[in-house]
Interface confidence: medium
């Protein structure tokens, strides 16, 4: 906290300019009018203040706007944004995408900070849903943004926004998140033809149910092993050997290298060894010939 002292004669700031970098903290406090600062915030960003000086400028704005800064000031905060706490940001009402972009630019190249997370949360809540333009902006700055949301938060993403999602945006999503996103993607891309559809839906398939995988196996999609390994185990288990062969196409040979890993390992255990042998890959661990397969989950459902 800077002590209140009178501004020395002749030092009263008439505008925000480079001469202020030579003011001591108490001089900034005493000689810079908060209203002037608010109207010339865009100039602050072009002046190499020290962090201590930025603290004083923030303090002045806090005094002027105890209920939270207006958007006209927020949009021009620039580097001063990094001085804000999540508590400060919770007082703001940010509605303009331009304001959001300006502040994300300040933090560009860094991990998502608590300040940025709070800002995004305030912005999205203010909009009511994660629209395409917002999602475009957020994933451009933070490719992992989508996967940082809870399944509940993801449910507010309209299918139209899915067009903005790139494969790398889903890299860190877990199955629960993909369960929410997959039906939206299916809806968004439903009017595309087979090969184009597969290219778009591929990164969302970690949320696909068995029946959709069966349908894809009829379309010569040649799914790569990396995608197959990300599928839900419970969705893969009911697939037949013939269906998996069709689904993977020439990539089926990759099953051998993955036979000890899920979901391939669990899928092998559910197949007849005879059927596995037809692949000619030397996959072992299937159900021996002559054994009866009891589907206990089906039995429980019937009883």
């Amino acid at each position: 906290e800077v002590e209140k002292t009178a501004c020395p004669s002749g030092k009263k700031a008439r505008e925000i300019d480079e001469s202020l970098i030579f003011y001591k903290k108490w001089e900034l406090e005493a000689c810079v009018d908060a209203a002037l600062l608010a109207t010339q915030m865009d100039r602050v960003n072009a002046i190499p203040f020290t962090y201590e000086q930025l603290d004083v400028l923030k303090h002045k704005l806090d005094e002027l706007y105890p209920q939270g800064y207006p958007e006209s000031v927020i949009q021009h905060l620039g580097y001063l944004f990094l001085k804000m706490s999540p508590e400060d940001i919770r007082k703001w009402n940010v509605t303009s995408l331009e304001t959001l972009k300006a502040l994300l630019e300040v933090n560009k190249g860094h991990e998502m900070s608590p300040q940025v997370a709070t800002l995004i949360d305030r912005f999205v809540k203010g909009r009511g849903q994660l629209d395409k333009d917002t999602l475009d902006t957020l994933t451009a700055f933070y490719p992992g943004y989508l996967c940082s949301l809870s399944p509940e938060e993801l449910s507010s993403v309209p299918p139209s926004s899915i067009w903005a999602v790139r494969p790398q945006d889903l890299d860190t999503c877990d199955p629960r998140q993909l369960d929410v996103l997959y039906p939206k993607a299916r809806l968004a891309f439903q009017n595309m033809n087979g090969s184009e559809y597969f290219v778009k839906i591929q990164s969302f398939l970690g949320g696909a149910p068995t029946e959709d995988l069966k349908a894809l196996s009829q379309q010569n999609v040649s799914m790569d092993l990396a995608t197959f390994m990300k599928l839900r185990t419970d969705a893969v288990l009911p697939l037949t050997v013939a269906e998996v062969q069709k689904l993977l196409g020439p990539h089926v040979e990759g099953l051998k290298a993955e036979e000890r890993h899920r979901p391939v390992r669990d899928w092998i255990l559910r197949q007849r060894q005879d059927d596995l042998d037809t692949l000619g890959l030397g996959l072992q661990g299937g159900i021996p010939n002559g054994y009866l397969v009891l589907d206990l989950s089906m039995q429980e459902a019937l009883s």
Partner: nanobody, 120 residues
Amino acid sequence: LQLVESGGGLVQPGGSLRLTCAASGFTLDNYAIGWFRQAPGKEREGVSSISSSGGSTNYADSVKGRFTISKGNARNTLYLQMNSLKPEDTAVYFCAASPRQLGPYYAMDYWGQGTSVTVS
């Protein structure tokens, strides 16, 4: 990225010193840079700054006409020529650099350890 100051020392009032700030790990072409000082028991204050292009310089009122800031031809050095030194110039002098000017947001991010100047 490192900044190292040198050239400080003991000098009589009215004398001169030339401080050097050497940057290692980066060149100063795209950096706004400046000299700051801190006297014992006092707050750190700005002395002089120079824009990344070298075309724009600024000075604190207390040193105007006596100190000159400049960038070296080697692209990684900054100088502060101090003439007509006074006892009140006694302080530890720091150089600082800011890469943010292209940002367009920036503040002084990188600081040297300082070099001591005593005028007595």
